[in-house]
């Protein structure tokens, strides 16, 4: 298995990976297996109200880059906690031998995958962005997640009740093939989204390849600069019981996705008051409706929030209210 | 493909529950406002309620207040109307429909399911 | 309540041209509804038509056009063919979710 891989964003279409070739392989490795795809933003996230009082924006960061050659350790799985600046404690005796213990397992384990697990392929041709190995099959191990490195354990062995998540066929997944270092830079990704990637290690290129069990890490790329932003008018429509009703278009490809938007309105000569509009609410209303506006001339700015922040506010938008003195309306409330 | 598909028809009797289902297919389904509208034999289109199935906030035409449930599992992409006691009279043809999908700017009802007829009859 | 009209019936030859038209009994229809509308053929269920009084729906002919005439929502269908020959729904957006559906109306194509 592929050691201690890092995974870091250097910008908002790519991000860099590193690790270490294995410390015990059977035989020489020939060439690593990258392979990657996008995850989904979890689906609680569309859901929340996060206009409501007391609910934080969800926390989403990036894989900040690289400190040093060492500074491998940080690379953030998806249970460590992203603001925790922690370093290691000092490795106890027991520790040590455990370690030690573990190496000697990895290697009889590795050769264990080598004969049991991986069903040996013919060679493949090439490398790109969809993989062309239809022909490779591997047994279920059962899905690891998202963690950085996958260490088996005894329900991961074929032929026992461990549950798989399914994942999307092998044959769909963009994949490089990397030969004589131990870095890639994955580039074409999409903005502020998070990605697991899958390393494996290799030593046989031909006539069949023989591939360590993966290592995972996730990473999640940077955001883009103006994703979050409205583009395109603010429209607005004037009902007869001085009622507003302001409607935008949701930005096409925010940082990961929009969970709110905040609306600042004024009338000439008074302050300027905030309304804050939920995913749900613009998934009603495609907008917002203002309501018991006094007469008078407004101005508006609307921006959205995404998972990355804000974007920017819009160029206001300006209507007026006339005095109804209380004409019946047509329109329910 | 975005698609909606309701469960099939049904044959109660005066005082039976009944609840049939709309299934998504193809969007996020949680973060869509779903509809419901009863169509009587012979007649016209009549709006009953709308559900949000991220949190299940629901609105009720104020004809159907009372009358029906709406609900939804996110969980399995599924909306459902629900009757405790049915009568004659809620013998229809009832439609699921998404409001406003993103495609479209202002408040409509985009895409619609075939329908489930439901006959009440002792 | 609310009470959304709509001409019960209504003739046209191949070819013609026909408006049809959607009314409130107390007040008038104005942009502010986003009127939509919807046909149905028999043992179908509906589609829609137009959006936001005059936008069309992805797929829809342009020979059908929405717009405001007067103090009513309109849907128009130039150079009518048989296959439009159906049942007619208007709604109204109220607010809050809420829709006002019209009575319909049923086109013949002569």
């Known amino acids: 298995v592929p050691l201690d891989p890092i995974s870091v964003s250097n910008s908002s279409s790519q991000i860099i990976l590193k690790w270490k070739p294995p410390s015990d392989p059977n035989g020489n490795i020939t060439h690593y297996l990258v392979f990657w795809e996008r995850q989904a933003e979890d689906s609680e996230l569309f859901e929340l109200d996060y206009c409501l009082k007391g609910l934080k924006l969800p926390s989403r960061t990036w894989s900040p880059p690289f400190e040093s050659e060492d500074s491998q350790k940080h690379n953030q799985s998806e249970y460590e906690d992203s603001a925790g600046e922690c370093c290691s404690c000092p490795k106890t005796d027991s520790q040590i031998l455990k370690e030690l213990e573990e190496s000697s397992f990895r290697k009889t384990f590795e050769d264990y995958l080598h004969n049991v697990v991986f069903v040996p392929r013919k060679t493949s041709s090439g490398t790109g962005a969809e993989d062309p190995r239809p022909s490779r099959k591997r047994r279920s191990l059962g899905d690891v997640g998202n963690v950085t490195v996958a260490v088996p354990t005894v329900a991961a062995f074929p032929n026992t009740s461990s549950t798989s998540v399914p994942t999307s066929p092998e044959e769909h997944r963009p994949f490089e093939k990397v030969v004589n270092k131990e870095s890639l830079v994955i580039s074409g990704l999409r903005h502020f989204t998070g990605y697991r990637i899958e390393l494996q290690a290799c030593n046989q290129d031909t006539p069949e390849e023989r591939c360590s069990v993966a290592a995972y890490v996730s990473a999640r790329t940077m955001p883009e600069a103006k994703a979050d932003d409205i583009v395109g008018p603010v429209t607005h429509e004037i009902f007869e019981n001085n009622v507003v009703h302001l409607m935008w278009q949701e930005p096409k490809e925010p940082n990961g996705l929009i969970v709110l938007y905040e609306v600042s309105y004024r009338r000439y000569g008074d302050e300027e008051l905030h309304l804050c509009v939920s995913r749900k609410h613009f998934a009603l209303e495609r907008g917002c409706r203002l309501r018991g506006l006094s007469p008078g001339n407004y101005s508006v700015r609307i921006r959205a929030t995404s998972l990355a922040g804000n974007g920017s506010w819009t160029e206001p938008t300006y209507f007026y209210v006339t005095d109804y003195l209380d004409v019946p309306s047509n329109i329910a409330k | 493909q975005m698609q909606l598909v309701q469960s099939g028809a049904e044959v109660k009797k005066p005082g039976e529950s009944l609840k049939i289902s709309c299934k998504g297919y193809?969007?996020?389904?949680?973060?869509?406002?779903i509809g419901w509208v009863r169509q009587m034999p012979g007649r016209g289109l009549e709006w009953m309620g709308i559900?949000?199935?991220?949190?299940?906030?629901?609105r009720y035409s104020p004809s159907f207040q009372g009358q029906v449930t709406i609900s939804a599992d996110k969980s399995i992409s599924t909306a459902y109307l629900q009757w405790s006691s049915l009568k004659a009279s809620d013998t229809a043809m009832y439609y699921c429909?998404?409001?406003?999908?993103?495609?479209?700017?202002?408040?409509?009802?985009?895409?619609w399911g075939q329908g489930t007829l439901v006959t009440v009859s002792s | 309540q609310t009470v959304v009209t709509q001409e019960p019936s209504f003739s046209v030859s191949p070819g013609g041209t026909v408006t049809l038209t959607c009314g409130l009994t107390?007040?008038?229809?104005?942009?502010?509804?986003?009127p939509s509308w919807y046909q149905q053929t028999p043992g179908q269920a509906p589609r829609m038509l137009v959006h936001s009084t005059s936008t069309r729906y992805s797929g829809v002919p342009d020979r059908f056009s929405g717009s405001i005439l007067g103090n009513k929502a309109a849907l128009t269908i130039t150079g009518a063919q048989a296959d439009d020959e159906s049942d007619y729904y208007c709604a109204l957006y109220m607010g809050g979710g809420i829709y006002v559906f019209g009575g319909g109306t049923q086109l013949t194509v002569l």
């Open positions: 429909a998404r409001h406003a999908p993103l495609a479209v700017a202002g408040m409509a009802l985009g895409d």
């Open positions: 193809g969007y996020r389904f949680s973060d869509n406002w």
């Open positions: 559900i949000y199935p991220g949190d299940s906030e629901t």
């Open positions: 107390s007040g008038s229809v104005s942009t502010s509804y986003y």
